[in-house]
Interface confidence: low
């Protein structure tokens, strides 16, 4: 089961090498646990494997397996990172017919400094 409003250790292998090691679910796309998020991430692996952007893996992990700090703050990916990745990878997204989730549309995300990210309280819905 999923612990209510507490950070949990990352178990998705692809994201275990990120600079953060705790996450929170559900994520922006409503995936309620890491196993579902991992399966959904598989659709995006052509982008990561072909390295369409140097930031692709960071973005995918921050989106699907978001950073969680101090138990109550979930950190979504920043808009600038999203825009960079989407711009870099647009051609491949089209080539592979990858559906970009509307929850990850860049204009829904906030501008923030990647080193000091905007956080949101998981008790409320994140609207960007």
């Amino acid at each position: 089961g999923h612990s209510l409003f507490t950070c949990e250790p990352i178990t998705v292998p692809r994201c275990m090498k990120m600079a953060y090691n705790m996450t929170f679910f559900p994520n922006l796309m409503g995936h309620y646990d890491q196993s579902i998020a991992a399966v959904e991430m598989e659709h995006f692996l052509p982008l990561a494997n072909l390295e369409c952007s140097p930031n692709i893996e960071t973005f995918l992990c921050k989106a699907f397996v978001p950073t969680c700090i101090e138990q109550i703050h979930v950190v979504p990916p920043c808009r600038k990172l999203c825009e960079k990745v989407y711009s870099d990878c647009k051609k491949l997204i089209d080539t592979f017919g990858i559906r970009w989730p509307e929850e990850l549309e860049c204009d829904r995300l906030q501008y923030c400094d990647e080193t000091v990210p905007v956080t949101f309280d998981p008790h409320t819905e994140f609207l960007g």
Partner: antibody
Framework: QVQLVQSGAEVKKPGASVKVSCKAS????????ISWVRQAPGQGLEWMGR????????SYAQNFQGRVTMTRDTSTSTVYMELSSLRSEDTAVYYC????????????WGQGTLVTVSS | DIQMTQSPSSLSASVGDRVTITCRAS??????LNWYQQKPGKAPKLLIY???SLQSGVPSRFSGSGSGTDFTLTISSLQPEDFATYYC?????????FGGGTKVEIK
């Protein structure tokens, strides 16, 4: 099936440069990430860096930074590795190999190119 | 950089023997570990990827296990064509690094 064919053996003098080619076939060229790995005589394997055929994005191992340049030619589905300021310790077999991703495993490998550095 | 340490560096075995080679990473690499076989004068050949997945076309006598820092390559029944050098490689982070190799020789 996917195949990587490398250029032939080279003999170079210390201080010179060498450029090794690796021609890919069997899949869309943009679907390749090519790594270069070298092996000195009787020694183990050493990763030098990689290049994405899709967008030319590269990453070099620190040991080779400043001396290695990896490029691609999409018109001929060929990747190149140039190593400059050669020294005797650079005598090795140089392999290109397809990476499963920008980090990953290597399969298949080219047949190898022996580069001998000798005065 | 992540250091990969293989042991033993060489071993002697007979056809039919069960052979085990170990590889240790200097830090946790999850299951980002691959195994290769190399014969003299030839390029390495991928045997196992992601710690335990058998590469297509590789005989089932080869198997891999482990996670974190400790990994094992096992050949369940050594065949004449298996005498070669075996390398592990981590694909957790760049620079990608290899173990020093294990040479499997005929006893």
């Amino acid at each position: 099936q996917v195949q990587l064919v490398q250029s032939g053996a080279e003999v170079k003098k210390p201080g010179a440069s060498v450029k090794v080619s690796c021609k890919a076939s069997g899949d869309t060229f943009s679907n390749y990430v090519i790594s270069w790995v070298r092996q000195a005589p009787g020694q183990g394997l050493e990763w030098m860096g990689r290049i994405s055929a899709y967008n030319g994005y590269k990453s070099y191992a620190q040991n080779f930074q400043g001396r290695v340049t990896m490029t691609r030619d999409t018109s001929t589905s060929t990747v190149y590795m140039e190593l400059s300021s050669l020294r005797s310790e650079d005598t090795a077999v140089y392999y290109c190999a397809r990476s499963s991703g920008y980090v990953g495993w290597f399969d298949p490998w080219g047949q190898g190119t022996l580069v001998t550095v000798s005065s | 950089d992540i250091q990969m340490t293989q042991s033993p560096s060489s071993l002697s075995a007979s056809v039919g023997d069960r052979v085990t080679i170990t590889c240790r990473a200097s830090q946790s690499i999850s299951s980002y570990l691959n195994w290769y076989q190399q014969k003299p004068g030839k390029a390495p050949k991928l045997l196992i990827y992601a710690a335990s997945s058998l590469q297509s076309g590789v005989p089932s006598r080869f198997s891999g296990s482990g996670s974190g820092t400790d990994f094992t390559l096992t050949i369940s029944s050594l065949q004449p064509e298996d005498f070669a050098t075996y390398y592990c490689q981590q694909s957790y982070s760049t620079p990608l690094t290899f173990g020093g190799g294990t040479k499997v020789e005929i006893k």
